[in-house]
């Protein structure tokens, strides 16, 4: 993968709540932030910008948490484990739109990826994802 | 292609690196269908402590 500059998103997207943050196309991401409490208040997914009726209320419900004796990654004092994940999307071409979080292409891809992870890991103790970056493959 | 990099956060003790990767790989086919994303070359690793955004730049898979 190329090491060239790319768009990145600093927003934490997580179950039950979401933190809206402005995103910039800088290669340096803002640190990951964890909400001080895991609220059950329904709110929207971060960076959400699809066309919906004005009266719409969109939310993700907090799933039941599971626990296990797995060995996990190093934790902060907040009791959170972090994992870095990377993958290729082979049917998409990188272009300049993915360097600019204000573009529709960037936001649609970020929204799809965020929603996908919220669903894949909703059965466990998933808190959210952060620092989404797109790079040329 | 597009390389996607991100950080996932879980409650302590609920999952490990292997299970994060296994679960993600399990739904690659569904992702292709639902979101039109053909996913390959999945790599998962622990984020070294202390956590910082700069830690991303040390990972090239």
């Amino acid at each position: 993968a190329s090491g060239s500059a790319s768009g990145s998103a600093s927003t934490l997207v997580h179950n039950g709540t979401s933190a809206r943050a402005t995103t910039t196309p800088a290669s340096k991401s803002t640190p990951f932030s964890i909400p001080s409490h895991h609220s059950d208040t329904p709110t929207t997914l971060a960076s959400h910008s699809t066309k919906t009726d004005a009266s719409s209320t969109h939310h993700s419900s907090v799933p039941p948490l599971t626990s296990s004796n797995h060995s996990t990654s190093p934790q902060l004092s907040t009791g959170v484990s972090f994992f870095f994940l990377s993958f290729h999307i082979s049917n998409l071409q990188f272009n300049s739109s993915l360097e600019d979080p204000s573009t529709d292409y960037y936001q649609e891809l970020q929204r799809d990826i965020s929603e996908m992870f919220l669903q894949i890991y909703k059965q466990g103790g998933f808190l959210g994802l952060s620092n989404i970056k797109f790079r040329p493959g | 292609s597009v390389v996607v990099q991100l950080t996932l956060a879980f409650r302590e003790g609920t999952i490990n690196v292997h299970d994060v990767e296994t679960q993600f790989n399990q739904y690659k086919t569904e992702a292709a269908s639902r979101y039109n994303l053909t996913i390959s070359d999945v790599s998962v690793s622990d984020v070294p402590f202390p956590f910082s955004a700069q830690s991303h730049h040390h990972h090239h898979h």
Partner: antibody, heavy 122, light 106 residues
Framework: EVQLVQSGAEVKKPGASVKVSCKAS????????INWVRQAPGQRLEYIGW????????KFNEKFKGRVTLTVDTSARTAYMELSSLRSEDTAVYYC???????????????WGQGTTVTVSS | DIQLTQSPSSLSASVGDRVTITCSAS?????IHWFQQKPGKAPKLWIY???NLASGVPSRFSGSGSGTDFTLTVSSLQPEDFATYYC?????????FGGGTKVEIK
């Protein structure tokens, strides 16, 4: 009992738009996807796109991009499909159908609306 | 897009007959769904994930297959089974449907 109830038949002129509604009951509306599928007379089923009421996120079959708008009103538990720039070949029965997010995606589209007939004629 | 070809496009059979419908995909898919549709009605999910019967579907129906070739079989056709059956793939976006197989009374 899960039910999807669609709006009534429509007759439209070429170039006009149509908006079909799909009201859900019997389950948590924001937990499942709503898909839209159409069937022209004597033809196979054709996929239009989906919307996830839990987020408003949606995706279309490229064939319909630029002409279709999918929306939801979660307070009314209703999904909408609007198709613009209608032409005669858009004459079809339009269906909404619910399905599941991961990890239950493989269950398929298990409940369908009764269908809305849209006739495009000058 | 992945093309699904069903064969036969129609068949005539008698009550009690064993009937097999095939669905062939233009490229490999992980699983398919089958729908039953009667005239003037919405499709009904009949078999999901290749071989699982949807709620309320009689056990005389079965589904099998993998890769590009899938089948729906009715072991002993009953009067209520006369309908059109469609296969659907969702391994690749957009989801696509077969052209249908109409099962008629002989």
């Amino acid at each position: 009992e899960v039910q999807l109830v669609q709006s009534g038949a429509e007759v439209k002129k070429p170039g006009a738009s149509v908006k079909v509604s799909c009201k859900a009951s019997g389950y948590t509306f924001t937990d499942n996807y709503i898909n839209w599928v159409r069937q022209a007379p004597g033809q196979r089923l054709e996929y239009i796109g989906w919307i996830y009421p839990g987020s408003g996120n949606n995706k279309f079959n490229e064939k319909f991009k630029g002409r279709v708008t999918l929306t939801v009103d979660t307070s009314a538990r209703t999904a909408y499909m609007e198709l613009s720039s209608l032409r005669s070949e858009d004459t079809a029965v339009y269906y909404c159908a619910r399905d599941y997010p991961f990890p239950s995606y493989h269950y398929g589209m298990d409940y369908w609306g009764q269908g809305t007939t849209v006739t495009v004629s000058s | 897009d992945i093309q699904l070809t069903q064969s036969p496009s129609s068949l005539s059979a008698s009550v009690g007959d064993r009937v097999t419908i095939t669905c062939s995909a233009s490229s490999s898919v992980s699983y398919i769904h089958w729908f039953q549709q009667k005239p003037g009605k919405a499709p009904k999910l009949w078999i999901y994930s290749t071989s699982n019967l949807a709620s309320g579907v009689p056990s005389r129906f079965s589904g099998s297959g993998s890769g590009t070739d899938f089948t729906l079989t009715v072991s002993s056709l009953q009067p209520e089974d006369f309908a059109t059956y469609y296969c659907q793939q969702r391994s690749s976006y957009p989801p696509t449907f077969g052209g249908g197989t109409k099962v008629e009374i002989k």
